[in-house]
């Protein structure tokens, strides 16, 4: 037999204990699918989130980071410290790559320059705390 | 910011039809279902329709079952309201609203009347 | 049908007066209940969803309260500007319905 919530369209919810009733989803909250027992609170952008979708009765906030920081995880759980290229991000804030290393992000860690030789080549350009060495021909 | 704008309202003579339209803007019309609401003059609000984001699911109220057709156009951002076999007792201002009845329209008056 | 019934049909108040207002349903209909005001010549604007939530813009000195079948809205210290007709509505089941309304005038 067919579930009788499965006609309550998205935006509603279906409640199994009136007759399988579809209900519209109070102000803020939605349900992104049809048939569903409730409707979810929307996100709400707050603090160092900005929302860069409204949420509907059918599809939720989504978030974006303010300016000086950028979005981790799914669905931008999580907004970090922008650094500048050069540098990268730690526990007492931005620090600049050590040497042999470079971000050219103002996000991610600082990584090791290329080693040419292990490709049997020679450093063209020299690398900078903000871009990796450049490898020419071979020696 | 979110608008909700009707049209459409008038004079009409008993037994006939009239469109209602509701123009909106300031949100993404097509993630939320409409309803229409009336308020006969002097009176309460009245539920009259209701159509699903995607117009999979429409409801009316039993007052205007097989007399009144509430639809929409999400690419123009729009609901309509059609009424046939209009009586005195629709006589009233017409609202539209989202679903989550947060935003009303200022409403457009219809009075059927010979 | 759900009925939402509500009392008093008006009343007369000082402005910085305490105002308390009901609505009852026919039947239970959990918390889906919202309050809407609306001035003369005016559409009507939500002030409480969910029986208790203020919705966005909306002065604390709304406060909406109750479940199930009896809901309350009050007005902490009714202004001038909060003279209008009230009204409460359920959005439990269709048939959505709404109560007659509580006209709210200065005395």
């Known amino acids: 037999l067919q579930d009788p919530c499965s006609n309550c369209p998205a935006g509603t919810f279906c409640d199994n204990n009136r007759n399988q009733i579809c209900s519209p989803c109070p102000p803020n909250s939605f349900s992104s699918a049809g048939g569903q027992r409730t409707c979810d609170i929307c996100r709400q952008c707050k603090g160092v989130f900005r929302t860069r979708k409204e949420c509907s009765s059918t599809s939720n906030a989504e978030c974006d980071c303010t300016p000086g920081f950028h979005c981790l995880g799914a669905g931008c759980s999580m907004c970090e410290q922008d650094c500048k290229q050069g540098q990268e991000l730690t526990k007492k804030g931005c620090k600049d790559c050590c040497f042999g290393t470079f971000n050219d992000q103002k996000r991610g860690i600082c990584r090791p320059w290329t080693n040419c030789s292990l490709d049997g080549k020679s450093v063209l350009v020299n690398g900078t705390k903000e871009r990796d060495v450049v490898c020419g021909p071979s020696p | 910011q979110v608008q909700l704008q009707e049209s459409g309202g008038g004079l009409v003579k008993p037994g006939g039809s009239r469109k209602l339209s509701c123009a909106a803007s300031?949100?993404?019309?097509?993630?939320?279902?409409m309803h229409w609401v009336r308020q006969a003059p002097d009176k309460g609000l009245e539920w009259v329709a209701y159509?699903?984001?995607?117009?999979?699911?429409?409801y009316y109220a039993d007052t205007v079952k097989g007399r009144f057709t509430i639809s929409r156009d999400n690419a123009k951002n729009t609901l309509f309201l059609q009424m046939t076999s209009l009586r005195s007792e629709d006589t009233a201002m017409y609202y539209c609203?989202?679903?989550?009845?947060?935003?009303w329209g200022q409403g457009t008056a219809l009075t059927v009347s010979s | 049908n759900i009925v939402m019934t509500q009392s008093p049909k008006s009343m007369s108040m000082s402005v910085g007066e305490r105002v308390t207002l009901s609505c009852k349903a026919s039947e239970n209909v959990g918390s889906y209940v919202s309050w809407y005001q609306q001035k003369p010549e005016k559409s009507p604007k939500l002030l409480i969803y969910g029986a208790s939530n203020r919705y966005t813009g909306v002065p604390d000195r709304f406060t909406g309260s109750g479940s199930a079948t009896d809901f309350t809205l009050t007005i902490s210290s009714v202004q001038a500007e909060d003279l209008a007709d009230y009204h409460c509505?359920?959005?439990?089941?269709?048939?959505?319905?709404f109560g007659a309304g509580t006209k709210l005038e200065l005395k």
């Open positions: 159509i699903s984001s995607g117009s999979s699911t429409i």
């Open positions: 609203a989202r679903d989550w009845v947060d935003y």
């Open positions: 509505g359920q959005s439990y089941s269709y048939p959505l319905t």
């Open positions: 300031g949100f993404t019309f097509s993630e939320f279902g």
